[in-house]
């Protein structure tokens, strides 16, 4: 059965450049290994932001990526992207792959539009 991936349509990053959003898939398959990839879509181009593989024992992901973190629980991944600036505003897609055991399944969310507003610089104080 096909997996459907859902994620919020819009998220506003914090003033510190941090955006958090869930990525969920259904139906929940009995899977030992789930790979989650965050992609950024600009025009017709897609670029990988970060990727990780979750297992029953390894539920904290993206350890190789300084700007991404995430936790996995059942069929839900809570994603956090940090270090965002206004130029990073865009559509971020969550791709979920059920890697093991076979069969392989893949699904992609419709994307989360992350809006990032750079904080105003502090005025000089006399």
């Amino acid at each position: 059965e096909a997996i459907q991936v859902t994620q919020p349509s819009v998220v506003l990053a914090s003033s510190h450049g941090v955006a958090s959003f869930p990525c969920e898939y259904s139906p929940s398959h009995n899977t030992d290994e789930v790979r989650v990839t965050v992609l950024r879509q600009t025009n017709d181009q897609m670029t990988e932001v970060c990727a990780t593989t979750f297992t029953e024992k390894n539920t904290v992901g993206f350890l190789d990526y300084p700007f991404c973190s995430g936790t996995f629980n059942e069929s839900r991944v809570n994603l956090t992207i940090q270090g965002l600036r206004a130029v990073d505003t865009g559509l971020y897609l969550c791709k979920v792959e059920l890697m093991y055991p076979p069969p392989y399944f893949v699904g992609m969310g419709n994307g989360t539009q992350i809006y990032v507003i750079d904080p105003e610089p502090c005025p000089d104080s006399d």
Epitope: Y100, F105, G107
Partner: antibody, heavy 119, light 108 residues
Framework: QVQLVESGGGVVQPGRSLRLSCAAS????????MHWVRQAPGKGLEWVAV????????YYVDSVKGRFTISRDNSNNTLYLQMNSLRAEDTAVYYC????????????WGQGTLVTVSS | EIVLTQSPGTLSLSPGEGATLSCRAS???????LAWYQQKPGQAPRLLIY???SRATGIPDRFSGSGSGTDFTLTISRLEPEDFAVYYC?????????FGPGTKVDIK
């Protein structure tokens, strides 16, 4: 430019073995999933197997499970298909193909190598 | 296993005419993970469309893909002489990654 060159095909008797190779160049081989797809004479395309970029995950079509093994050598940019217990119905042109980075469709293909299983 | 059915089996048309090729899946798969390929005799297949509707690099805009769920369509707006070939659809949403049986587009 991306190039995939298969080799190792030939005529083999039923029950015997054969190993196909696919030499890849023009891209970062270790970043892509790689597939074998076959085509029997005058017939359509049949996906055979895939191996993920790091070699950890492999999937096969049911008809070759337990007989064929896909593997890769990322240091030599080479993909392999070990075919054991060959049957007449395995006769086909075997293509290696690159799985596109964002989904397992095939953006580059080799020219194919013909495997004929006959007594 | 997802079974793909293509229709018609053969399409006989003249250059300049439009062609509509259908691909139907036995069950739905995720995110429109469907591709179309063109194959000419003695050659390897060539990717035309992925993601049901995105044209691959270098593919002319007379080729377009559409559809979702279980029903997909490849449209060739005006057939050029080099377009006469066999066309295959393929799903890559779940393993095994199956192909349809193909539609042959030949010259009337």
């Amino acid at each position: 430019q991306v190039q995939l060159v298969e080799s190792g095909g030939g005529v083999v008797q039923p029950g015997r073995s054969l190993r196909l190779s696919c030499a890849a160049s023009g891209f970062t081989f270790s970043s892509f999933g790689m597939h074998w797809v076959r085509q029997a004479p005058g017939k359509g395309l049949e996906w055979v197997a895939v191996i993920w970029y790091d070699g950890r995950n492999k999937y096969y079509v049911d008809s070759v499970k337990g007989r064929f093994t896909i593997s890769r050598d990322n240091s030599n940019n080479t993909l392999y298909l070990q075919m054991n217990s060959l049957r007449a119905e395995d006769t086909a042109v075997y293509y290696c193909a690159r799985g596109e980075f964002f989904g397992e469709f095939f953006d580059y293909w080799g020219q194919g190598t013909l495997v004929t299983v006959s007594s | 296993e997802i079974v793909l059915t293509q229709s018609p089996g053969t399409l006989s048309l003249s250059p300049g005419e439009g062609a509509t090729l259908s691909c139907r899946a036995s069950q739905s798969f995720s995110s429109n993970y469907l591709a179309w390929y063109q194959q000419k005799p003695g050659q390897a297949p060539r990717l035309l469309i992925y993601g049901a509707s995105s044209r691959a690099t270098g593919i002319p805009d007379r080729f377009s893909g559409s559809g979702s769920g279980t029903d997909f369509t490849l449209t060739i707006s005006r057939l050029e002489p080099e377009d006469f070939a066999v066309y295959y659809c393929q799903q890559y949403g779940t393993s095994p990654f199956t192909f349809g049986p193909g539609t042959k587009v030949d010259i009337k």
